[in-house]
């Protein structure tokens, strides 16, 4: 069964800067990755970035830099100020559309006890939805 993992990290140098890393553990071909915050994409969440394997990357503030790390994992640096700044309990979600498995999404947030610069290991997060 495919799985999606999500890792959220707050940068020690900039407390309003977060790095989100997501990966897809499956054998299929990824056709699109959508990163959102505030909940799952399409269920109250706000899209931060869309990564298409062929067409490129579209990102929305406060996303600063989205990139593919491998063929099945991505990272996104977020930095905000004021109303658009993420906070420690913000939920970030990654949705991977793949063939033939379909869409798989998982969410994560900063571990409750984490210090800036630390993060939980990138273990598979609970799968919220499989379309």
């Amino acid at each position: 069964t495919p799985e999606v993992w999500v890792q959220v990290r707050m940068e020690a140098t900039e407390l309003s800067s977060f790095t989100i890393r997501c990966g897809f553990l499956g054998s299929g071909s990824i056709s699109l990755v959508t990163v959102s915050w505030g909940g799952p994409n399409g269920a109250g969440g706000t899209t931060l970035a869309v990564l298409h394997p062929e067409r490129g990357i579209r990102q929305w503030a406060p996303a600063r830099q989205a990139r593919w790390e491998t063929q099945s994992s991505i990272s996104l640096i977020l930095e905000g100020s004021g109303a658009s700044s993420p906070c420690a309990n913000t939920t970030f979600c990654c949705k991977f559309a793949s063939f033939p498995e379909g869409s798989w999404e998982a969410c994560g947030s900063l571990p409750p006890s984490s210090d800036p610069g630390l993060s939980a290991p990138p273990t598979p997060a609970p799968i919220l939805r499989a379309d």
Epitope: E54, G56, Q65, R67, T70, Q71
Partner: antibody, heavy 120, light 113 residues
Framework: EVQLQQSGPELVKPGASVKISCKAS????????MNWVRQSHEKSLEWIGE????????NFNQKFKGKATLTVDKSSSTAFMDLRSLTSKDSAVYYC?????????????WGQGTSVTVSS | DIVMTQSPSSLAMSVGQKVTMSCKSS????????????LAWYQQKPGQSPKLLVY???TRESGVPDRFIGSGSGTDFTLTISSVQAEDLADYFC?????????FGGGTKVEIK
């Protein structure tokens, strides 16, 4: 044949607003994002933002957020850009440009440009 | 934002000569997913709009003469005009189409001697 026909030149006073139009023809308007780009002597080409004509979703260069508003009229296949609180620094040629089908932000067709001059 | 730097700012060549211009990006434009470089080149003739010549660093847009050759990877890119013609008098701009916001270089002006 794909064509993007922009409205004519504008001479406006500082503090005023202006609305530029870009009428698309020769393709299905809602199938391609529309980008807006500014060209001035000092700053070469600068991306202002984009709009998805299908649903009106927009995305901006943070530098132009609050300066530009992007809209579309699907019935006439026309994209619009409103520029507000104009200053002399906003004097430039403004282009609409269609995003190509191969990649985000590779712009395969451009309008002829609309010259905006801000002067008292 | 990704910063694009072009050089030289201008050059003057005779018809038939080979022209090369450079474009450098402040971060890699190579996707780790598909190994494509998200770099485009545009030509802007005097009084005209920009015209897409090349995207993905080396893919020529339909209808563009094969004397226009895009190359490079990562952060360093080159546009070559193998045998420059009088009608190639123009400004040439590189642009990253890797991610939002797309950014342009300052341009290279090609003049014909």
């Amino acid at each position: 044949e794909v064509q993007l026909q922009q409205s004519g030149p504008e001479l406006v006073k500082p503090g005023a607003s202006v609305k530029i139009s870009c009428k698309a023809s020769g393709y299905t308007f809602t199938d391609y994002y529309m980008n807006w780009v500014r060209q001035s002597h000092e700053k070469s080409l600068e991306w202002i933002g984009e709009i998805n004509p299908n649903n009106g979703d927009t995305n901006f260069n943070q530098k132009f957020k609050g300066k530009a508003t992007l809209t579309v009229d699907k019935s006439s296949s026309t994209a619009f850009m409103d520029l507000r609180s104009l200053t002399s620094k906003d004097s430039a040629v403004y282009y609409c440009a269609r995003e190509g089908g191969s990649s985000y932000y590779a712009m395969d067709y451009w309008g002829q440009g609309t010259s905006v001059t801000v002067s008292s | 934002d990704i910063v694009m730097t072009q050089s030289p700012s201008s050059l003057a060549m005779s018809v038939g000569q080979k022209v090369t211009m450079s474009c450098k990006s402040s971060q890699s434009l190579l996707s780790n997913n598909n190994q494509k470089n998200f770099l485009a080149w545009y030509q802007q003739k005097p009084g005209q709009s920009p015209k897409l010549l090349v995207y993905f660093a080396s893919t020529r847009e339909s209808g563009v003469p094969d004397r226009f050759i895009g190359s490079g990877s990562g952060t360093d890119f080159t546009l070559t005009i193998s045998s420059v013609q009088a009608e190639d008098l123009a400004d040439y701009f590189c642009q990253q189409h890797y991610s939002t916001p797309p950014t342009f270089g300052g341009g290279t002006k090609v003049e014909i001697k």
